[in-house]
């Protein structure tokens, strides 16, 4: 691990906050054809919001209305399905929130069909038990992956049954997916109902649909793929963490810091302290004291939380979560306000607002 040894009385230079990315899977908004859909961009303090669909800039039109942090789609059609993103550009950073829109007729999607857990996977073709295609495991068809790091491999699967045995074909963004559509093409294994794309790149982003059909019917399922290009960067700290906290004397408090980093990060919790009655050194930088740092026996989860037990007035002040790797350092700060215990008259002055 790269080491950033901050000890008491060291100073910390502020760095530009990084761009923040959504790490978890996106929410899915479902609408039936013809319905209207309204989605609010779930980002705080958004000065300017821009929208994209499947990685392409999204502007207003006769059916798409963009008002502030809201996106409205009137008279939705299946073509409106896809991976949407809103990006909030602020003066100090930018943040992107992803969500998916799925405009589909529940019956044609096949996702809601009553199904066994695969007991009927291999119905004999020459039996009289004719059956339209069906998914062998509808629960697994719910799972979609938000993002895959570039240079890795993606595997789409749509295991299905039916009699006669259905055939499978693939679409990308609603159009026939051909080998020449991507460098290196793709590989299909019909016996495993799977398609593989090796060494994915950002241009592979989009909606991939498997269409499974026989003479008795057709079902389809769409996967939404985002490809993330990872370049080395200093740690990314989750927006809004640590959050300001307040407690009474004798109470307990915790600060949480979520760190995302390509290179292994070194995380420290720091308290801004006074020396000789001053919070700042001759160079104008703050005096700091390391409260907690990652050690040999400390897990990442443990270091992400700072607990302060039996709080005193001296604990009030500014706390900083600092994360460094071989590329650089990032930090977020929050304030702890300590209030007198009930029944005590002594007051404490209000603490400053959240600082980053």
């Amino acid at each position: 691990r790269p080491s950033f040894s901050l000890v008491e009385d060291t100073t910390l230079e502020p760095e530009e906050p990084p761009t923040k990315y959504q790490i978890s899977q996106p929410e899915v908004y479902v609408a039936a054809p013809g319905e209207s859909l309204e989605v609010r961009c779930l980002l705080k303090d958004a000065a300017v919001i821009s929208w994209t669909k499947d990685g392409v800039h999204l502007g207003p039109n006769n059916r798409t209305v963009l008002i502030g942090e809201y996106l409205q789609i009137k008279g939705a059609t299946p073509r409106d399905s896809g991976l949407y993103a809103c990006t909030a550009s602020r003066t100090v950073d930018s943040e992107t929130w992803y969500f998916m829109v799925n405009v589909t007729d529940a019956i044609s999607s096949g996702d809601d069909e009553d199904d066994t857990d695969g007991a009927e996977d291999f119905v004999s073709e020459n039996s009289n038990n004719k059956r339209a295609p069906y998914w062998t495991n509808t629960e697994k068809m719910e799972k979609r992956l938000h993002a895959v790091p570039a240079a890795n491999t993606v595997k789409f699967r749509c295991p299905a049954g039916g009699n006669p045995m259905p055939t499978m074909r693939w679409l990308k963004n609603g159009k026939e997916f051909k080998q020449e559509h991507r460098i290196g093409g793709y590989k299909v294994r019909n016996q495993h109902w799977s398609l593989i794309m090796e060494s994915v790149v950002p241009s592979d982003k989009g909606n991939y649909t498997c269409v499974v059909e026989n003479e008795y019917g057709s079902i389809n399922h769409t996967y939404h793929l985002d490809v993330v290009e990872r370049s080395p960067h200093r740690p990314i700290l989750q927006a809004g963490l640590p959050a300001n906290a307040s407690t009474v004397v004798g109470g307990d408090v915790e600060f949480v810091c979520k760190v995302y980093s390509d290179a292994q990060p070194h995380i420290q919790w720091i308290k801004h302290v006074e020396k000789n009655g001053s919070k700042y050194g001759p160079d104008g930088l703050p005096y700091l004291k390391v409260l907690k740092a990652a050690g040999v026996n400390t897990t990442d989860k443990e270091i992400e939380v700072l607990y302060i037990r039996n709080v005193t007035f001296e604990d009030a002040g500014e706390y900083t979560c600092l994360a460094g790797n071989s590329i650089g350092i990032s930090f977020h700060s929050a304030w702890l306000t300590v209030l007198p215990a009930p029944g005590r008259e002594k007051e404490i002055t209000a603490s400053p607002d959240y600082l980053e």
């Epitope: 790091p149 570039a150 240079a151 595997k155 793929l225 990872r230 990060p265």
Partner: antibody
Framework: EVQLVESGGGLVQPGGSLRLSCAAS????????ISWVRQAPGKGLEWVGR????????NYADSVKGRFTISADTSKNTAYLQMNSLRAEDTAVYYC????????????????????WGQGTLVTVSS | DIQMTQSPSSLSASVGDRVTITCRAS??????LAWYKQKPGKAPKLLIY???FLYSGVPSRFSGSGSGTDFTLTISSLQPEDFATYYC?????????FGQGTKVEIK
């Protein structure tokens, strides 16, 4: 051309420590991962552990957990295997291998495949 | 841990022969199985991943099949450079585990 070059092997006494390096070139280091695999003389392959260079996460075989540590320096495109409390049974040729994920969108796991391997470095633990 | 058992442990064959190696997992690994080839004193090389997908640059005489617990590596027409030891490996369970290897020797 993708290349992985291991170094740092040698003779060490039981209880001792050794650090192996794996210098990588020819690919975007932070996109994939590095696995360490060892092979005792005349024996089969044994997976030791893996680091995902994108998020810094690591996984280890039970036989080395708590004794071995995998890390990486992305600025040098180099992965490391720090081996402490070495035992005679750790004697083996140690390989590093580029490891990429097959992200299966149907199930909730990622299959890990080792597609490029280094030439190996011999570690001998003996008194 | 998931145990991977290969059979046979060794086999003798001639150039041009069709060779089949099997690998059995102690529990379901879906299609999360790879095959590697290793020559003496050399590092292993990836042949097949996801049970049946041929890795780039690997000759088409190699093929893989199976899912769940039973897998097969087939060499349709054995070539001189194919005499080596072959390993299967699963990565759906932790830890990743290899089979004990199958040595293909010249008859």
């Amino acid at each position: 051309e993708v290349q992985l070059v291991e170094s740092g092997g040698g003779l060490v006494q039981p209880g001792g420590s050794l650090r192996l390096s794996c210098a990588a070139s020819g690919f975007t280091f932070t996109s994939t991962g590095i696995s360490w695999v060892r092979q005792a003389p005349g024996k089969g392959l044994e997976w030791v552990g893996r680091t995902h260079l994108g998020d810094g996460s690591t996984n280890y075989a039970d036989s080395v957990k708590g004794r071995f540590t995998i890390s990486a320096d992305t600025s040098k495109n180099t992965a490391y295997l720090q081996m402490n409390s070495l035992r005679a049974e750790d004697t083996a040729v140690y390989y590093c291998a580029r490891t990429y994920g097959i992200y299966d969108l149907y199930v909730d796991y990622t299959e890990y495949v080792m597609d490029y391997w280094g030439q190996g470095t011999l570690v001998t633990v003996s008194s | 841990d998931i145990q991977m058992t290969q059979s046979p442990s060794s086999l003798s064959a001639s150039v041009g022969d069709r060779v089949t190696i099997t690998c059995r997992a102690s529990q379901d690994v879906d299609t999360s199985l790879a095959w590697y080839k290793q020559k003496p004193g050399k590092a292993p090389k990836l042949l097949i991943y996801s049970a049946s997908f041929l890795y780039s640059g690997v000759p088409s005489r190699f093929s893989g099949s199976g899912s769940g617990t039973d897998f097969t590596l087939t060499i349709s027409s054995l070539q001189p450079e194919d005499f080596a030891t072959y390993y299967c490996q699963q990565s759906t369970g932790h830890p990743q585990t290899f089979g004990q290897g199958t040595k293909v020797e010249i008859k």
